[in-house]
Amino acid sequence: MAVTACQGLGFVVSLIGIAGIIAATCMDQWSTQDLYNNPVTAVFNYQGLWRSCVRESSGFTECRGYFTLLGLPAMLQAVRALMIVGIVLGAIGLLVSIFALKCIRIGSMEDSAKANMTLTSGIMFIVSGLCAIAGVSVFANMLVTNFWMSTANMYTGMGGMVQTVQTRYTFGAALFVGWVAGGLTLIGGVMMCIACRGLAPEETNYKAVSYHASGHSVAYKPGGFKASTGFGSNTKNKKIYDGGARTEDEVQSYPSKHDYV
């Protein structure tokens, strides 16, 4: 039951995270005008990955897309790429994880296949989350660098008479959405990987005896898997419900094996 819950929760957390990454990528507020020096500006500027916007105090908002590709800073292109890769990996991960969910039956899919799919989607979510966090962090670093550069040149005098106030930009809402979303996707991916360990059946059929270095006693397994030859009717390692009692050693050795019917 715990593995199903972990898998399901991992899926939901990742789903929310990827939705957040998509939202952050589409948002216009990656950087917003710093109002520290001019809190009463009548014109408010903010920028996204795809366009820059200006909002006047009347409420009128005008946005202009970055229609050039070659003219854009390499860092912005890199952030775009990271976010898109994150979305694509996340979307594929979601698709894979839907089929990997324990609660969904698809034909006669084996537990080993579901375990592999769960692991695959988990890794995809982890990479997706890392891409988003990296993208947002690169953009944030770019902002911090530009902020201090523009602070150094805050006022450029024109003939000693006229002041030109340079517009400085600070962190926008999209950065925080991106960080949180990337973190959630990462956590969801880790949860999927943990769930995979619980889903995976044992690698060999021969699980009848457990040895103890300290003593000569042998604990015999009351049932479960067909022992000895391994060529019985249960050659595919399918779990046979064994209503029998387990020894303390078994519970410690194989905590996940008896979780499911």
Partner: antibody, heavy 119, light 113 residues
Amino acid sequence: EVQLVESGGGLVQPGGSLRLSCAASGFTFSTFGMHWVRQAPGKGLEWVSYITSGESPIYFTDTVKGRFTISRDNAKNSLYLQMNSLRAEDTAVYYCARSSYYGQSMDYWGQGTLVTVSS
Amino acid sequence: DIVMTQSPDSLAVSLGERATINCRSSQSLLNAGNRKNYLTWYQQKPGQPPKLLIYWASTRESGVPDRFSGSGSGTDFTLTISSLQAEDVAVYYCQNAYSYPFTFGGGTKLEIK
């Protein structure tokens, strides 16, 4: 047709108070920001205050900060300017003006109401 | 606060001639975000409220004759009346529309020579 009609002006003693009103018609009042601009006799224009369509934020010129308050009643299509601690230099024709949707300009103006501060 | 300085204080131009009014701001009115200059021009005839002529430094308000044009960027701006008509006699004001408090220039009185 857009119309702005100011009222409430008159003679007041220094230190006194006055409340100006501006009745708006011919447009959706609640969607536009509104300004108060004044003009002393024989002088130029001086911007006084601005209130956004959503009643916040509001802005004032430094000379009236703390003495004047701007407000609006969207249900009544009305703009108000409460003037306290009036001084002789506040004597002027007070215009209410509608903020145009773009360009931060004032596209429609009332005819103005005269406020005289004198003892 | 942004200080707006207009020149000349008064101007006399013959009918049909070109009239030019200048306006300078103490800070740039150019917004980098949209490359627009937040400067507005108004016309005020005697006994009347001001009338909006030009916003964003060069965009004519609807209904304003095309003989009125605005130009300039940053801190220096110009209002030009290409062919002066008798009804253009008025006081012209430039206004900072970039940051609060909004400030007006002192005005330029335009007369017929």
